[in-house]
């Protein structure tokens, strides 16, 4: 057991031209906060895949208002660390997503708003108990500087927090900076020292004196970038002599998925589909209860009060899987009829219909309406053997002969305000949206 700690040092415009001045303004004061998502292994960084190592939300930073004419400073940040506790072994390799959010404090239609400013992701190797690692990531015109470390919670020690170590009551015979470790009376826990000259950026070690390379680097000291241009196979470990990837086993060979999980290859790695009760990159995390928050993407957990009873995740629309970890590709069900193009907008499905067809799923053939009369510019739509009229703005009823409130159908998206006008309707869009119907 232990804690992953993230310290944000600064967030602000990156170097170079075209950098934004500030996410806040005199008209729109705001404050920043951060979300971090951790995943074991060098896994996919898709934001919707599960944060199987854990996630955290920071407190909100102080209110900031840009001063006109003043140089853009680094923005005021929340106090304190973001801490993500982990119960099991620290995996050594992990992926992260850090999101910078802005809480807008001006007068918002519909109350306070959150908007995402930047999302950075990366893959790292990190031994628990080591020093703080510093990092700089850029997302568009923004730059985020931060440090992170993983530390074990006593009595756990070691690079994976899997050994138990406790001070002995007898006086210690270990030298300065070393501590006695149970169960061996004469064993001392020492800081890990890698091979001399091992690249601090691209190398790491799990045993004293070794130098193992991060993905993309090779050589005895991990100082040589891997070049795959002259390589025959994209699989396998890198060769120290050529810098090339040499053929190796497929990612699913030997089934890396534990606890009955099934393995499928992905373009860059593999993916385990885990049975209920297990999750993690290799289905290695078990004994999960609802208190561990195993349901991702807003899924709600039922049952699972203790490790021996199963939990069930009820997934919100658009997600599936035993932990709501998979985004549903709703267009794969081909819901658009008559050759319509399917668009999955995340919050809804849209069908873009071919000429001559209409309806939410392009189910109406407009060609069958010949001779039907719709008044006031209405359009006839075939549906289930009976025609109906799709009326122009301002008209309603079976044949579009009745006056109607053009705002009654709430045509303005994303919280926009609708105003009836002699020529139709006008949408006043909420901040951050635009278009005739606030659709962008």
């Amino acid at each position: 057991a232990g804690v992953f700690e993230l310290q944000i040092h600064s967030f602000g415009p990156g170097p170079g031209p075209g950098a934004p001045r500030s996410p806040c303004s005199a008209r729109l004061p705001c404050r920043l906060f951060f979300r971090v998502c951790l995943k074991p292994g060098l896994s996919e960084e898709a934001a919707e895949s599960p944060c199987a190592l854990g996630a955290a939300l920071s407190a909100r930073g102080p209110v900031y208002t840009e001063q006109p004419g003043a140089p853009a400073p680094d923005l005021p940040l929340p106090d304190g660390l973001l801490q993500v506790p982990f119960r099991d072994a620290w995996p050594g390799t992990f992926s992260f997503i850090i999101e910078t959010w802005r809480e807008e404090l001006g007068d918002q239609i519909g109350g306070p708003a959150w908007s995402l400013l930047a999302r950075v992701a990366g893959r790292r190797r990190l031994a628990a108990g080591g020093p703080w690692a510093r990092d700089i990531q850029r997302a568009g015109a923004w730059e985020l500087r931060f440090s992170y470390r993983a530390r074990c919670e006593p009595p756990a020690v070691g690079t994976a927090c899997t050994r138990l170590c406790r001070p002995r009551s007898a006086p210690s015979r270990c030298g300065p900076g070393l501590r006695p470790c149970a169960p061996l009376e004469d064993e001392c826990e020492a800081p890990l020292v890698c091979r001399a000259g091992c690249s601090p950026e691209h190398g790491f070690c799990e045993q004293p004196g070794e130098c193992r390379c991060l993905e993309g680097w090779t050589g005895p000291l991990c100082t040589v970038p891997v070049s795959t241009s002259s390589c025959l196979s994209p699989r396998g470990p890198s060769s120290a002599t050529t810098g090339c990837l040499v053929p190796g086993p497929g990612p699913c060979d030997g089934n890396p998925c534990a606890n009955g999980g099934s393995c499928s290859e992905t373009p860059r790695s593999f993916e385990c589909t885990c049975p209920r009760g297990f999750y993690g990159l290799r289905c290695e995390v078990s004994g999960v209860t609802c208190a561990d928050g195993p349901c991702f993407n807003g899924g709600l957990c039922v049952g699972g009060a203790d490790p021996d009873s199963a939990y069930i995740c009820h997934c919100p629309p658009g997600f599936q899987g035993s932990n709501c970890e998979k985004r549903v590709d709703r267009c794969s069900l081909q819901p658009c009829r008559n050759g319509g193009l399917c668009l999955d907008l995340g919050h809804a499905l849209r069908c873009r219909c071919r000429a001559g067809f209409a309806g939410p799923r392009c189910e109406h053939d407009l060609d069958d309406c010949a001779g039907r009369a719709c008044a006031n510019g209405g359009t006839c739509v075939e549906g289930g053997g009976a025609h109906r009229c799709s009326c122009a703005l301002g008209f309603g009823g079976r044949d579009c002969r009745e006056r109607a409130d053009p705002c009654a159908a709430r045509p303005c998206a994303h919280g926009g305000r609708c105003y009836a006008h002699f020529s139709g309707l006008v949408c006043a869009c909420a901040p951050g949206y635009m278009g005739a119907r606030c659709e962008f």
Epitope: P112, A113, W114, G293, P316, F319
Partner: nanobody, 129 residues
Framework: QVHLMESGGGSVQAGGSLRLSCAAS????????MGWFRQAPGKEREGIAT????????YYADSVKGRFTISQDNAKNTVYLQMNSLKPEDTAMYYC??????????????????????WGQGTQVTVSS
């Protein structure tokens, strides 16, 4: 099945107080927001208060600031809404909801219904003058 169960509604004179409770059965909500919404006859559903249990972030609608207080009891999986100085215009059906920013969202309104995927059945509050 997920259940959010509201209680504590009733009738009260203007200036009086009520305390609503929302019990969430069968799951922990520490990574979610829990919110209170209300809907008066003929009006849209409006968000009035919401809380994130992980960092105790709270939001209130302007119409209830200083009068209503949202709080939580993580051990009981329950969220409360303490309503003081009630006014006749507070008369509505009050709903409890759970949710948060959807994955990959780049904008979210904590006091608006989108993103709240789970809702209770509601409890009626009537304030007479």
């Amino acid at each position: 099945q997920v259940h959010l169960m509201e209680s504590g509604g009733g009738s009260v004179q203007a200036g009086g107080s009520l305390r609503l409770s929302c019990a969430a059965s069968g799951y922990t909500y520490r990574s979610n927001f829990m919110g209170w919404f209300r809907q008066a006859p003929g009006k849209e559903r409006e968000g009035i208060a919401t809380i994130h249990s992980g960092v105790a972030t709270t939001y209130y609608a302007d119409s209830v600031k200083g009068r209503f207080t949202i709080s939580q009891d993580n051990a009981k999986n329950t969220v409360y809404l303490q309503m003081n100085s009630l006014k006749p215009e507070d008369t509505a059906m009050y709903y409890c909801a759970a949710g948060g920013p959807p994955a990959n969202a780049d904008r979210w309104y904590p006091l608006r219904p989108p993103g709240y995927n789970y809702w209770g059945q509601g409890t009626q509050v009537t304030v007479s003058s």
